[in-house]
Amino acid sequence: QETEDPACCSPIVPRNEWKALASECAQHLSLPLRYVVVSHTAGSSCNTPASCQQQARNVQHYHMKTLGWCDVGYNFLIGEDGLVYEGRGWNFTGAHSGHLWNPMSIGISFMGNYMDRVPTPQAIRAAQGLLACGVAQGALRSNYVLKGHRDVQRTLSPGNQLYHLIQNWPHYRSP
């Protein structure tokens, strides 16, 4: 069952709901965090809970079984079904933006490739709700700084269209 905190605008699909493999991660984040890094998975998008659960499993399988990571790299994944999928969550250090930024940021990744199109309005609302939720829960500072993945590493992520979009979000700061 999706859990919805009263302060959150969008429900978060817990790991057991999307049948995640057990995490082997141990490094904790020091909350509240000052940074959020937005990326895209650059793979397939999904627009139903069933297909997004499968996509979250695919990403996690690649990260754990191919790359040898302790879990899916992202703290949260965003589906075009308008739902947020719990990755490492608020408390564990991700593997999304390199060694410099991982320990001091939350990594949220939109499932899909956003070089040539923007995510659905539902996905955008879900991400914005998650960020509001993070502030309300004390996981993010109220003056947190939002960055695109390409602002912190040499990459095309989060894709041209999504990158242009997040540059208009209130907490975005350029490199």
């Epitope: 141990a26 490094q27 593997a95 390199g98 060694h99 410099l100 320990p103 590493q153 040499r154 490199p175």
Partner: antibody, heavy 119, light 106 residues
Framework: EVQLQQSGAEFVKPGASVKLSCTAS????????IHWVNQRPEQGLEWIGR????????KYDPNFQGKATITSDTSSNTAYVQLSSLTSEDTAVYYC????????????WGQGTLVSVSA | QIVLTQSPAIMSASPGEKVTITCSVS?????MNWYQQKLGSSPKLWIY???KLAPGVPARFSGSGSGTSYSLTISSMETEDAASYFC?????????FGAGTKLELK
């Protein structure tokens, strides 16, 4: 919080060897490269070499090949550099630093260890 | 080995003054990193991948350049910016640093 904690100062005689340690907290060294860099008194920075603790792969600057040996122990999240046949020219502060496997910059640095070589 | 030549070696600037430190490269590289070091402390990553600011670095700092010429600029010098700055390149295990620029407060 990410930290690289280095061992204390070493005062040694010419010809001796010394082994310096660098213990990481806040991250797993297996997910990074650990580098060693030195800084002679009033001088610039020189890269010595690095280790990939996930597989013990090492690379060295040619100037330090034979002088430095870098190792790691993932169970204690610690990297080491052993410096051999020390001379006064090796007197310097030695820093460990960490980098992502896919990035080309040193994200975090230890506080440094002074090695002083004198008869 | 790729040689990085920094200039000037030492400079002083007044608060509010614009400061530019340059790093010339003996053969073309794709990006440059910069570290700040204060007396008695270890270096800190300051600017990486030519123009990206490390977390917590004030926005008055910027980095630019390409090929064989790179620079670090402070738009308006502040007291806390007095330090040594080192450029650094890493290309296929030719990792080298510049000799450093000592920036003093005038």
């Amino acid at each position: 919080e990410v930290q690289l904690q280095q061992s204390g100062a070493e005062f040694v005689k010419p010809g001796a060897s010394v082994k310096l340690s660098c213990t990481a907290s806040g991250f797993n060294i297996k997910d990074t490269y650990i580098h060693w860099v030195n800084q002679r008194p009033e001088q610039g920075l020189e890269w010595i070499g690095r280790i990939d603790p996930a597989n013990d792969d090492t690379k060295y600057d040619p100037n330090f090949q034979g002088k430095a040996t870098i190792t790691s122990d993932t169970s204690s999240n610690t990297a080491y550099v052993q410096l051999s046949s020390l001379t006064s020219e090796d007197t310097a502060v030695y820093y460990c630093a960490s980098s992502d496997n896919s990035d080309s910059w040193f994200a975090y640095w230890g506080q440094g260890t002074l090695v002083s070589v004198s008869a | 080995q790729i040689v990085l030549t920094q200039s000037p070696a030492i400079m002083s600037a007044s608060p509010g003054e614009k400061v530019t430190i340059t790093c010339s490269v003996s053969s073309s590289v794709n990006f440059m990193n910069w570290y700040q070091q204060k007396l008695g402390s270890s270096p800190k990553l300051w600017i990486y991948d030519t123009s990206k600011l490390a977390p917590g670095v004030p926005a008055r700092f910027s980095g630019s350049g390409s090929g064989t010429s790179y620079s670090l600029t402070i738009s308006s010098m502040e007291t806390e910016d007095a330090a040594s700055y080192f450029c650094h390149q890493w290309s296929s295990y030719s990792l080298t640093f510049g000799a450093g620029t000592k920036l003093e407060l005038k």
